[in-house]
């Protein structure tokens, strides 16, 4: 059969027709439309936007577009009882208070329903005490404080700067250290790039700007009250005391003007080294407490936010496949924002909208994809990936049997320097081949391919002439699909130059200043980077849904498995005596990786040679490719993290945003020298090697000839 059995457009023009239909001007128009008012999860405004998107996707030509609603736990500030932090004197009088809201950006002064900065899911409380500065509140920062500096955070309020790791990990670390409250702030060292003006004159964070965000430690659970199951009409909900991942101490975020007032009085220990100093004109003393003249003053938090079960709405659009309608390629990104969502998420949602429009145009001309494409506008991502996770829990049986791939579509830009891709190794070759066919939007690369500019600006650390592709971590809606269900996943966006810009994320992330104007004036006036991201995301979806043989290369998994095995072995070999004492061997893992490599190589050879006109054999080979990612799922999950089930990748236990390879072994080895029972600890390392080796071997066998 021709490669075009699902369509009446000539094969070689399929992808071209789809890509040519994507227009920067449309993405710009959609972004403007999506960013004029706040679309906070659980609000009427976001429900109205869901209905608008449903209506427009129908107009664009999708076969069906439905709303899927769930009743999940969300968190909001108390409108009449604002959250703030005070410095109090010995009489308990408040001598300084942090801001109650951000100064609104020009043109938005009269917009209602701008949620003030808060840490979503913080418990209520009014703790008061001495302050301890804990740098980024990473695991290693608390090790430095407790082990090296002998500073006890128990009963203290800690102040930590945003950046480096997910804020929920910071709060978890502070709780474990015994803190009774956490203040999060944005330091100019991390959120103010040198030589750039503050918003509205540039893309830097002003002193009154504050990063919102949730502080959960869900570990993939979704709605905290219904872990593992959808939060539907007949759901059984846990009590709040049994909810998953909620913080136990009050937490509140502030900007650097307010942070200056808290940090300038800090006394106690000096910072241990320069890596603990930010860019404020303060000593960055660790504390505890204020210096001499101010030693009787304390810090008091006033947190009155409430957790409420609230209805959320996903929009799910379907474009039915002509040949394999029971195989699903999913393109999803969230719709809910903290405020205007100029970058997060609407720069992504606008791209999805244009991709849907382009697919719809082709469909109206008589074309259909080979496989079914599902489009999703997720709700409540900012509150813990709730919309995507609940939908996947509700549809898990279908997804695990039919899910080919998931492409994520949150923010299209976090800079305008080069492409950034995180994906399963199965998609490496797809991404390479696609970017070689796309034009680079970068200055100085006119007439060159995206692959070329990307490789030049972001080279692979291992393979010369190839671009860097990173591991998937979490902190976005692909999590449930990849980490829980084992569906091959990927994400792409334009990013900053990490070499020259050391700040974390982009400066205005989750602030009121993330507006349409931020994008249109400073990041992408021509929307050429948005268009490129649309071409990459849309092109991946097109190929995954339309190619006769799935565009997965299992040999690339073999390569990374060897790399990850080498890495974890070298970590373990930092303890040669214990490995000998407890007979720790990685032989089984290396043997499994070797077997995987050989079987993957043979499978790839068969893939070149088989009769593609035989639909049964074609389907069989494609199913082996589709189910390979699924084969890395351990139904029992990782220790204490049952919804992280992928044995090769999981979000780091120390930073949800980062991916860790062989996470079970890694966590078993982490800080093993401090474990009270070394025999038990090394026993767990051995067990995790066993699980990993078995899983790799089992996955390899799914690629063997079936009989």
């Amino acid at each position: 059969k021709s490669s075009n059995e699902a369509t009446n457009i000539t094969p070689k023009h399929n992808m071209k027709a789809f890509l040519d239909e994507l227009k920067a001007e449309n993405i710009k128009k959609f972004l403007y439309n999506f960013t004029q008012i706040p679309h906070l999860a659980g609000t009427e405004q976001n429900f109205q936007l869901a209905k608008q998107i449903q209506s427009q996707w129908k107009e664009f030509g999708l076969d069906s577009v439905e709303l899927a609603h769930y009743d999940v736990l969300l968190s909001y500030p108390n409108k009449t009882h604002p959250n703030y932090i005070s410095i109090i004197n010995e009489d308990g009088n408040e001598i300084f208070n942090t801001s109650l809201f951000e100064p609104p950006p020009p043109g938005y002064e009269n917009v209602s329903d701008i949620v003030p900065p808060f840490s979503a899911f913080s418990p209520q409380g009014m703790p008061e005490g001495d302050l301890v500065y804990v740098n980024y509140a990473r695991t290693e920062d608390f090790f430095k404080l407790e082990r090296d500096m002998k500073i006890n955070c128990s009963g203290k309020i800690v102040i930590a700067r945003y950046g480096k790791v997910f804020r929920g990990n910071k709060v978890k670390n502070a709780q474990l250290a015994g803190a009774k409250g956490v203040i999060l702030y944005s330091d100019p060292a991390d959120y103010f790039a040198p030589g750039v003006k503050s918003y509205p004159d540039g893309w830097n964070l002003p002193g009154g700007g504050v990063q919102r965000g949730n502080i959960l430690n869900l570990n993939g659970a979704g709605d905290p009250l219904t872990p593992g199951y959808p939060a539907n009409e007949y759901a059984y909900r846990r009590g709040i005391a049994e909810a998953v991942g909620l913080p136990s101490i009050p937490v509140h975020p502030i900007g650097y003007y307010d942070a200056q007032k808290l940090l300038e009085k800090m006394g106690g220990s000096a910072p241990p080294d320069s890596s603990w100093r930010g860019s404020l004109k303060v000593p960055y003393n660790v504390g505890p407490g204020f210096t001499g003249n101010f030693s009787t003053q304390k810090v008091k938090m006033h947190i009155h936010s409430t957790n409420e079960v609230t209805r959320i709405y996903n929009v799910i659009g379907t474009l039915r496949g002509a040949v394999e309608p029971d195989r699903y390629v999913i393109l999803g990104g969230h719709r809910d924002s903290w405020v205007f969502g100029g970058i997060d998420p609407q720069s992504g949602a606008a791209v999805v909208h244009e991709i849907v429009r382009s697919f719809g145009t082709l469909k109206k001309e008589g074309w259909r994809p080979r496989r079914t494409i599902l489009f999703a506008s997720w709700d409540a991502e900012e509150f813990g990936l709730l919309g995507s996770t609940e939908w996947a829990e509700e549809n898990s049986r279908l997804l695990q049997e039919r899910g080919v791939a998931y492409i994520n579509a949150d923010s299209s830009i976090e800079g305008n320097y080069t492409l950034r891709v995180d994906c399963t190794p199965l998609m490496y070759s797809l991404v390479h081949n696609l970017t070689k066919e796309l034009k680079s939007p970068d200055e100085g690369f006119e007439g060159k391919s995206l692959y070329e500019s990307w490789t030049k600006k972001s080279p692979s650390p291992e393979f010369s002439g190839m671009p860097r592709i990173s591991k998937l971590g979490s902190g976005n809606d692909f999590e449930v699909f990849f980490q829980r269900l084992g569906i091959a996943s990927g994400r792409a966006r334009y990013t900053k130059n990490w070499e020259t810009n050391k700040f974390s994320g982009y400066p205005l992330y989750h602030s009121v200043y993330e507006t349409y104007e931020l994008v249109e004036k400073f990041y992408d006036p021509m929307f050429k980077y948005h268009l490129t991201v649309a071409q990459v995301r849309g092109g991946m979806v097109f190929e995954l849904a339309n190619s006769i043989v799935l565009p997965f290369d299992c040999r690339d998994y073999a390569v990374v498995l060897r790399k990850y095995a080498d890495k974890i072995y070298s970590i373990s070999m930092k303890h040669p005596q214990e490995m000998k004492t407890y007979s720790v061997s990685f032989d089984s893992l290396f043997s499994a990786v070797k077997n995987f490599t050989e079987i993957a190589s043979k499978f790839s050879e068969r893939l070149q040679d088989f009769d593609k006109s035989n639909p049964i054999v074609l389907r069989m080979m494609n199913d082996q490719l589709m189910f390979l990612e699924r084969a890395f799922i351990d139904p029992l999950g990782l220790p204490d993290r049952p919804f992280y089930r992928h044995v090769i990748y999981a979000p780091s236990s120390h930073n949800k945003y980062a991916g860790e390879s062989f996470p079970g072994i890694y966590d078993a080895l982490f800080d093993i020298e401090s474990k009270v029972d070394p025999s038990k600890a090394w026993g767990e390392v051995k067990r995790q090697i066993y699980v990993a080796a078995f899983t790799v071997q089992a996955a390899a066998e799914t690629l063997s000839e079936v009989a």
Epitope: P104, P106, E109, Y257
Partner: nanobody
Framework: EVQLVESGGGVVQPGRSLRLSCAAS????????MNWVRQAPGKGLDWVAF????????YYADSVKGRFTISRDNSKNTLHLQMNSLRPEDTAVYYC????????????????WGQGTMVTVSS
């Protein structure tokens, strides 16, 4: 046009009260800290009070602490100064002044002034 217009001044007996107002136009009051500054006859300028853009902090000169209260209504673009227990030494022209920096947490330099309103405390 960016401007500040003060009102509410007048002649008042010692121990009595007066409420000054300042109407802002041409800029978003909600984004800026605001000050009251006064100039007694034949004297230099004296800072009186400051309120942050969001009303979370108020600072006062020692000479007026406990007697004067600065407040603001961002929805109406107005600033107020409630002056109680007035004294003859409070006699001055009172100016409202906009802080230069968006979102400042403490008084900074002023960049926009009103024309002033005269307050005379006399028996």
């Amino acid at each position: 046009e960016v401007q500040l217009v003060e009102s509410g001044g007048g002649v008042v007996q010692p121990g009595r009260s007066l409420r000054l107002s300042c109407a802002a136009s041409g800029f978003p009051l909600i984004s800026y800290g605001m000050n009251w500054v006064r100039q007694a006859p034949g004297k230099g300028l004296d800072w009186v009070a400051f309120i942050t853009y969001d009303g979370s902090n108020r600072y006062y000169a020692d000479s007026v602490k406990g007697r004067f209260t600065i407040s603001r209504d961002n929805s109406k673009n107005t600033l107020h100064l409630q002056m109680n227990s007035l004294r003859p030494e409070d006699t001055a022209v009172y100016y409202c002044a906009k802080d230069r920096i968006v979102g400042a947490r403490v008084p900074d330099a002023y960049d926009i002034w009103g024309q002033g309103t005269m307050v005379t405390v006399s028996s």
